[in-house]
Interface confidence: low
Amino acid sequence: PEPPTACREKQYLINSQCCSLCQPGQKLVSDCTEFTETECLPCGESEFLDTWNRETHCHQHKYCDPNLGLRVQQKGTSETDTICTCEEGWHCTSEACESCVLHRSCSPGFGVKQIATGVSDTICEPCPVGFFSNVSSAFEKCHPWTSCETKDLVVQQAGTNKTDVVCGPQDRLRA
């Protein structure tokens, strides 16, 4: 092989020399020389580096700010960042989860198709014929209309997407 003009994986070129990169969780203190290997130091408390690197400073762990509705889902290590998620009833506004908003509620006439998670909002769907929702809720699905027939009753008032049917007694023929 000819002298290096590029270095192999997990090395970097400096002053026509190939030096080892620092492993994840460590930062660069000094480049290698003809006689010494690259000098690296572990990241401090609340710091991390997640790649083989030549960084002279570690990154700070993300802060999960409770004022923004955030809490720690997974504590950071020297090699990984902290992962935040949202408090119950809230969800992240972005993939990075930098802030939270309240889960959306489904209005009357709409039911919950998919309950919200820490990272995705509630998905609502209109109640189809035969179903209704009379509340604003982040959890309630559309409910089926009551079946008057099974109760030996008759429909006195038709149901809508927001209201149930009203059942009543059957009219009896008098003698």
Epitope: E2, P3, R8, C19
Partner: antibody, heavy 119, light 112 residues
């Protein structure tokens, strides 16, 4: 400190094979190419080839191609050189030597392994 | 293959005197990155070679400053400014710019 410790002396018959080992310590084994150099009695130094332990890539001196195989075991930080179809003129001291990537010279050497080929 | 020819084959120098060993290459050892890939080694009887000088002029770790390398292109010199008794050895030049890497035939240095 960097150390390369080689296996002991070998006596072989013509046509046989020999496998010499070189155990490295004191540095990151996969970060440096390992070279093999031989020296016949009273003669000069002859470069046989080298191996990159990280990828397993080899460079052989054409003179030995087809007869020599260089391998490594990264789990034990050991390099191996096997020479086949031995002849009497393969009698020599065989050295492993680390290539200093920053120097591009052979910066640390094993103590040598004497291989004698005799019928 | 690049041929390295050392001169003289043997050399006797008085203690404290200067010793000069030459090495001539059959083609240039200067890389496009401006480095010259010519190195010098010292070998004492029964021992492996030791790196003295790398890339033309650079002394390896622990090598006394009485050893120096010089030259350019195809002609190179190893100089020992003031010979000491422990410098008695065989000296080899080596190139690592083209495979196969090659060594000079060696120069035996003795005390006069």
């Amino acid at each position: 400190q960097v150390q390369l410790v080689q296996s002991g002396a070998e006596v072989k018959k013509p046509g046989a094979s020999v496998k010499v080992s070189c155990k490295a310590s004191g540095y990151t084994f996969t970060g440096y190419n390992m070279n093999w150099v031989r020296q016949a009695p009273g003669q000069g130094l002859e470069w046989m080839g080298n191996i990159d332990p990280y990828y397993g890539n080899t460079n052989y001196n054409q003179k030995f191609k087809g007869r020599v195989t260089m391998t490594t075991d990264t789990s034990t930080s050991t390099a191996y050189m096997e020479l086949r179809s031995l002849r009497s003129d393969d009698t020599a001291v065989y050295y492993c030597a680390r290539l200093g990537l920053q120097l591009y010279a052979l910066d640390y050497w094993g103590q040598g392994t004497t291989v004698t080929v005799s019928s | 293959d690049i041929v390295l020819t050392q001169s003289p084959d043997s050399l006797a120098v008085s203690l404290g005197e200067r010793a000069t060993i030459n090495c001539r290459a059959s083609q240039s050892l200067v890389h496009s990155n401006a480095n010259t890939y010519l190195h010098w080694y010292q070998q004492k009887p029964g021992q492996p070679p030791k790196l003295l000088i790398y890339k033309l002029t650079n002394r390896f770790f622990g090598v006394p400053d009485r050893f120096s390398g010089s030259g350019s292109g195809t002609d190179f010199t190893l100089t020992i400014s003031s010979l000491q008794a422990e410098d008695v050895a065989v000296y080899y030049c080596q190139q690592s710019i083209h495979v196969p890497w090659t060594f000079g035939q060696g120069t035996k240095l003795e005390i006069k």
